[in-house]
Interface confidence: medium
């Protein structure tokens, strides 16, 4: 690696491409410093003048290095059926996901728009599949053998109770009765839950800032456009 | 690591033409512009031709422009210098030199092949 | 005669402070582009030392530095060591020519 850096703004060469966290302006043909997360550009460079960062307002946030002239606008506050999972900083847009019993129906690109409780299984029917972060539950009748008695979102049909003598026998929403001789069960007693959906998301971090694709090596001048925006625009 | 062996110098008399090679090896060959520069006896370093990592794009010094063609073959990790109505002028060192993809400049050189114009 | 202009020799001592300027005009150096430096040991090929005007490559001894200031540059070199003796080349790109230009060099002897 270079033990120094070189000083921008500066005029690539034809073949050569400007470095990691500087970008090509188009109006003064020359290689300048991006902005650092956190800050966006106050003044544009000139031929003689490196771009000039200023720090992003109350509410506002960039997330990359940029030269966007102003800085983007946190998400509005997270609703009542959500939780704040990142706050809103100079560095990151504000993340609002659901809370325990509810699932993500409509997502944006970082956390949810909009959630849903999750569907609760009526007695005579189980949970088929849980629910997940972007899921909701999808509920089977219970098969002969097997009941739920429950309204929930987390409990799988059950095995009815083996009986000795039967004194009622179980239906899809209801136990066997057995009469007083002692029952045995094929499972263990009591309802099974299935786990709720815990949020996993991990806080977003900045990506590792290496050049994705090869450098351009054309030799036209001036280089080509890269678009200004801070959302597209990598280290 | 990256090496880069100029082959096809020699001596040729005023008028004729010599085709110079360039094997390259150890690195992205289409990732980088190519160039040659030149060198005689006891002077200074002259650029003489460019080229793009895909070729598409060429740029020659004034004094060597309708005479000299630089080419690529990138499947061959090969560049290429055809060089036509050759004058004494041209007798040099020719090296064969990889751009640094950021900021510029040549960053690895060839040991450099002699051309002799003389009849 | 060099689109760029370099002095044709310097001297030092070792352990002392040379430096080699290179200047040039508003369609290289002054355009903003950048200047590099080369070192030519006697029978070798060139050697980059410095890129866009103060980078170093991996290698190269932090003895040498590049400067840049308008239309001129300069390579200093700290500490002058005796393997230090060769040829010095500016390098930069130039629009009006369209194409790369070179100092004239300049032979470094260390005394």
């Known amino acids: 690696l270079p033990a120094q850096v070189a000083f921008t703004p500066y005029a690539p060469e034809p073949g050569s491409t400007c470095r990691l966290r500087e970008y090509y302006d188009q109006t003064a043909q020359m290689c300048c410093s991006k902005c650092s997360p956190g800050q966006h550009a106050k003044v544009f460079c000139t031929k003689t003048s490196d771009t000039v960062c200023d720090s992003c307002e109350d509410s506002t946030y960039t997330q990359l290095w940029n030269w966007v002239p102003e800085c983007l606008s946190c998400g509005s506050r997270c609703s009542s059926d959500q939780v704040e999972t990142q706050a809103c900083t100079r560095e990151q847009n504000r993340i609002c996901t659901c809370r325990p019993g509810w699932y993500c129906a409509l997502s944006k690109q970082e956390g949810c728009r909009l959630c849903a409780p999750l569907r609760k299984c009526r007695p005579g029917f189980g949970v088929a599949r849980p629910g997940t972060e972007t899921s909701d539950v999808v509920c089977k009748p219970c098969a002969p053998g097997t009941f739920s008695n429950t309204t929930s979102s987390t409990d799988i049909c059950r095995p009815h109770q083996i009986c000795n003598v039967v004194a009622i026998p179980g239906n899809a929403s209801m136990d066997a009765v057995c009469t007083s001789t002692s029952p045995t069960r094929s499972m263990a007693p009591g309802a099974v839950h299935l786990p709720q959906p815990v949020s996993t998301r991990s806080q977003h971090t900045q990506p590792t800032p290496e050049p994705s694709t090869a450098p351009s090596t054309s030799f036209l001048l001036p280089m080509g456009p890269s678009p200004p925006a801070e959302g597209s625009t990598g280290d | 690591q990256v090496q880069l062996l100029e082959s096809g110098g020699g001596l040729v008399q005023p008028g004729g033409s010599l085709r110079l090679s360039c094997a390259a090896s150890?690195?992205?060959?289409?990732?980088?512009?190519m160039t040659w520069v030149r060198q005689a006896p006891g002077k200074g370093l002259e650029w003489v031709s460019g080229?793009?990592?895909?070729?598409?794009?060429?740029f020659y010094a004034d004094s060597v422009k309708g005479r000299f063609t630089i080419s690529r073959d990138n499947s061959k990790n090969t560049l290429y210098l055809q060089m036509n109505s050759l004058r004494a002028e041209d007798t040099a060192v020719y090296y064969c030199?990889?751009?640094?993809?950021?900021?510029?400049?040549?960053?690895?050189w060839g040991q450099g092949t002699l051309v002799t114009v003389s009849s | 005669q060099s689109v760029l202009t370099q002095p044709p020799s310097v001297s030092g001592a070792p352990g002392q402070r040379v430096t080699i300027s290179c200047t040039g005009s508003?369609?290289?150096?002054?355009?903003?582009?950048?200047v590099h430096w080369y070192q030519q040991l006697p029978g070798t090929a060139p050697k980059l030392l410095i890129h866009?005007?103060?980078n170093r490559p991996s290698g190269v001894p932090d003895r040498f530095s590049g400067f840049k200031s308008g239309t001129s540059a300069s390579l200093a070199i700290t500490g002058l060591q005796a393997e230090d003796e060769a040829d010095y080349y500016c390098?930069?790109?130039?629009?009006?020519?369209?194409?790369?230009?070179f100092g004239g060099g300049t032979k470094l002897t260390v005394l």
């Open positions: 030199a990889r751009q640094s993809q950021y900021v510029g400049g040549f960053d690895y």
């Open positions: 150890g690195f992205s060959f289409t990732s980088y512009a």
């Open positions: 080229i793009s990592g895909g070729g598409a794009a060429t």
């Open positions: 508003s369609s290289n150096i002054g355009a903003g582009y950048g």
């Open positions: 866009g005007n103060t």
């Open positions: 390098q930069s790109y130039d629009s009006s020519l369209s194409g790369w230009v």
